[in-house]
Amino acid sequence: QQQTLPKPFIWAEPHFMVPKEKQVTICCQGNYGAVEYQLHFEGSLFAVDRPKPPERINKVQFYIPDMNSRMAGQYSCIYRVGELWSEPSNLLDLVVTEMYDTPTLSVHPGPEVISGEKVTFYCRLDTATSMFLLLKEGRSSHVQRGYGKVQAEFPLGPVTTAHRGTYRCFGSYNNHAWSFPSEPVKLLVTGDIENTSLAPEDPTFPADTWGTYLLTTETGLQKDHALWDHTAQNLLR
């Protein structure tokens, strides 16, 4: 006899990276007929939802109207059908951004390079942090972690046109509290001797749509829960 139900899926909308004082919804999808969902935060019960009518609902949404550092961390959810509880979902890392300061991102030898050249990004932040994150806009899996007292370097090695795109960096005060994003740096790679038509360019956004990027970059992953444990989340573990 089955002692537990299958684990639910958990994800954040519009994004797991949430600017402080902004809203986020944590979604938990279980089974039709579930009479109660529980959202747990860092091992403690955070919220409860009892869908009505349960037989017609297989997903609940927990709304956080005002993100802050106290709510940044790891979430999981469970659900109950009758007296039988599910396995816990995978962990969702919820990150608060726009904390404290703004780092500076630079690139060497420059933003316009030839394919095959070695490129290094430098992220600098003069406040108390030793961990830095470099994100390539367009795909949340393009996240690198670096360390340094006030600056971290991110060597990309010999680049190809696949490295083209817009980059930003964050300083990380802990795994779940990040700085404001840096200003964007757009890397242009030209002269690839390979077939450049086979090297798709990530979608990039002008600087003023970074907010929109944060709201949309997870969308594809959230629609396919099997992909939810993606690199950006795993990087936080």
Epitope: A47, D49, I64, P65, M71
Partner: nanobody
């Protein structure tokens, strides 16, 4: 901006009853999930009871069957009816709100709440 004002605290004997009230200012009360927390001297603030916009409730194990949370949207007020009071119920009781939220969300963790009252003292002693 939401302001919360608690009332109804006082001194009561063990086994007695009290009803706490929390009056909320503003027109956002109907879109708020509400909760009661308490803090005893020298202890951390702990969850007592919560109620969703749609009147779903959740209680701490220690008060289940003794305390009842309810709300009156017409009066912008949430209540905590406390009966069979014990010495260990002695604490400052705080009302809190999550504004806005979805209809059936019940919040248990204090970090979720974005508005707090100043508290009212409940003392249970012979």
């Amino acid at each position: 901006e939401v302001q919360l004002v608690e009332s109804g605290g006082g001194e009561v004997q063990p086994g007695g009853s009290l009803r706490l009230s929390c009056a909320a200012s503003g027109r956002t009360f109907a879109s708020a999930a509400m909760g009661w927390f308490r803090q005893a001297p020298g202890k951390e603030r702990e969850f007592v009871a919560a109620i969703s916009r749609s009147d779903d409730t959740y209680y701490a194990e220690s008060v289940k069957g003794r305390f009842t949370i309810s709300r009156d949207n017409a009066k912008n007020t949430v209540y905590l009816q406390m009966s069979s009071l014990r010495a260990e119920d002695t604490a400052v009781y705080y009302c809190a709100a999550v504004v806005p939220t979805y209809g059936s969300n019940i919040y248990v963790h204090s970090a979720a709440y974005n508005y707090w009252g100043q508290g009212t003292l409940v003392t249970v002693k012979p």
